[in-house]
């Protein structure tokens, strides 16, 4: 920390300018007025202060504002934002979606940090949900950032939050996440024709249930290998060769190329070799023809 | 060690541009403001301006804003410094400089970059 | 801009003689920086905040000063502390040097 010391003749801070850079940091912590600081601090990333000046910058809003900065004071943070702690970020309110842009702006290109974690946290909270609005912007600063949520959290997604995610927006989203997801996707695009519908909730298919890629089979929507390596494996059990046959169209020549990868190698166990066989892919691995699949699963809920 | 090495020298004809590096060595490149200067041939030194490598924020002395770009590229540690419309006013070693912790002089130099404008 | 004006211009000095040059600025500044510099070689930095060594600088060289006025003293000259001097400042925007001291040996 720097030491009190009286700003020297001539040297008091009358605005926010160049002049500042060359302040020692003990100048700037006697110079530089808090109140003049935290008035200005939209000149503040236009001029290129130290990590250590920035510091003192840092310190003396803190000073200013113990309770936590004002809204108008963050939104031009700039660079000092990466300054902060996440314990800093916790005692602020942040309501604009432009504060937001602004503070992720100066953090793009890098990692999501904890400051950035406990930022978006704190944004979404004070909203009580994930709106369109703020789910666009979090997601094209952070492409990941809906997979970084738990499904409790994703939960309060509403659906008309939907249209503004992106393929490349659920990569990295495990089968839990898509399981929240789905239902929401389904609703939102609802009211499309098949063929947009399809494209739209492709990439979303990896939390829908059999019952639902029973009925895409049946839209002659040619799913591809890739999207149909994602869905569930228990989704993905029941569906019947021809079933299979018509959700992939062209594309099932490719289960051959899978055979032994899930969900394709476990679908395969689950058939007659000779419904496999009408494929003419050489896929291997069926029930033999003459043997009798007892269903347990089905027997266990009779009893 | 702490070491600046500037780019070699440069024959350049008038109304050109010539872009002069600077390359880091032994410090963390982010921690330090990068400043250049100007010395005319048998003349003293001039401040061109800096850039802050942290952030790419610069400051410039008056006399050079449209005549000098400064730029850095993190990843390797260098900073850069453009000169723009070349004259033969432009002739001069120019110089790399490490601003030292909290303001404390030019604590490093680079070897300079001799510049020579002529047709 | 401040101005600093470096006096004299050319100095010759013995070997073992103590020298004296100064820095005059045209206001008041807060910290002085003095810089050597040899033909062929980038300037080096000898003081810094107007009266402290910097890491190598031989403990024959000193600042002081305050205000408009500062000084730079080497209390005995050897060969090969002859080139020229040049002081800065950066307490006023921007950055400005001084026109130089040459420092010869007699």
């Known amino acids: 920390e720097v030491e009190k010391t009286a700003c020297p003749s001539g040297k008091k801070a009358r605005e926010i300018d160049e002049s500042l850079i060359f302040y020692k940091k003990w100048e700037l912590e006697a110079c530089v007025d808090a109140a003049l600081l935290a008035t200005q601090m939209d000149r503040v990333n236009a001029i290129p202060f130290t990590y250590e000046q920035l510091d003192v910058l840092k310190h003396k809003l803190d000073e200013l504002y113990p309770q936590g900065y004002p809204e108008s004071v963050i939104q031009h943070l700039g660079y000092l934002f990466l300054k902060m702690s996440p314990e800093d970020i916790r005692k602020w309110n942040v309501t604009s979606l432009e504060t937001l842009k602004a503070l992720l702006e100066v953090n793009k290109g890098h990692e999501m940090s904890p400051q950035v974690a406990t930022l978006i946290d704190r944004f979404v909270k004070g909203r009580g949900q994930l709106d369109k609005d703020t789910l666009d912007t979090l997601t094209a600063f952070y492409p990941g950032y809906l997979c970084s949520l738990s499904p409790e959290e994703l939960s309060s997604v509403p659906p008309s939050s939907i249209w503004a995610v992106r393929p490349q927006d659920l990569d990295t989203c495990d089968p839990r996440q898509l399981d929240v997801l789905y239902p929401k996707a389904r609703l939102a695009f609802q009211n499309m024709n098949g063929s947009e519908y399809f494209v739209k909730i492709q990439s979303f298919l990896g939390g829908a249930p059999t019952e639902d890629l029973k009925a895409l089979s049946q839209q002659n929507v040619s799913m591809d290998l890739a999207t149909f390596m994602k869905l569930r494996t228990d989704a993905v059990l029941p569906l019947t060769v021809a079933e299979v046959q018509k959700l992939l169209g062209p594309h099932v020549e490719g289960l051959k190329a899978e055979e032994r990868h899930r969900p394709v190698r476990d679908w395969i166990l689950r058939q007659r070799q000779d419904d496999l066989d009408t494929l003419g892919l050489g896929l291997q691995g069926g029930i033999p023809n003459g043997y009798l699949v007892l269903d347990l699963s089905m027997q266990e809920a009779l009893s | 060690e702490v070491h600046l090495q500037q780019s070699g020298p440069e024959l350049v004809k008038p109304g050109a541009s010539v872009k002069i590096s600077c390359k880091t060595s032994?410090?963390?490149?982010?921690?330090?403001?990068m400043h250049w200067v100007k010395q005319s041939h048998g003349k003293s030194l001039e401040w061109i301006g800096l850039?802050?490598?942290?952030?790419?924020?610069?400051s410039y002395n008056q006399k050079f804003k449209g005549k000098a770009t400064l730029t850095v590229d993190k990843s390797s540690s260098t900073a850069y410094m453009e000169l723009l419309s070349l004259t033969s006013e432009d002739s001069a070693v120019y110089y790399c400089a490490r601003r030292g912790y909290d303001n404390e002089g030019f604590d490093y130099w680079g070897q300079g970059t001799t510049l020579t404008v002529s047709s | 801009d401040v101005v600093l004006t470096q006096s004299p211009a050319i100095m010759s000095a013995s070997p073992g003689e103590k020298v004296t040059m100064t820095c005059s600025a045209s206001s008041s500044i807060s910290y002085m920086y003095w810089y050597q510099q040899k033909p062929g070689s980038s300037p080096r930095l000898l003081i810094y905040d107007t009266s402290n060594l910097a890491s190598g600088v031989p403990v024959r060289f000193s600042g002081s000063g305050s205000g408009t006025s500062y000084s730079l003293t080497i209390s005995r000259m050897e060969a090969e502390d002859a080139a020229t001097y040049y002081c800065?400042?950066?307490?006023?925007?921007?950055?400005?040097f001084g026109g130089g001291t040459k420092l010869e040996m007699k």
């Open positions: 032994g410090y963390t490149f982010t921690e330090y403001t």
């Open positions: 850039i802050n490598p942290y952030n790419g924020g610069t």
């Open positions: 800065q400042q950066w307490s006023s925007y921007p950055p400005t």
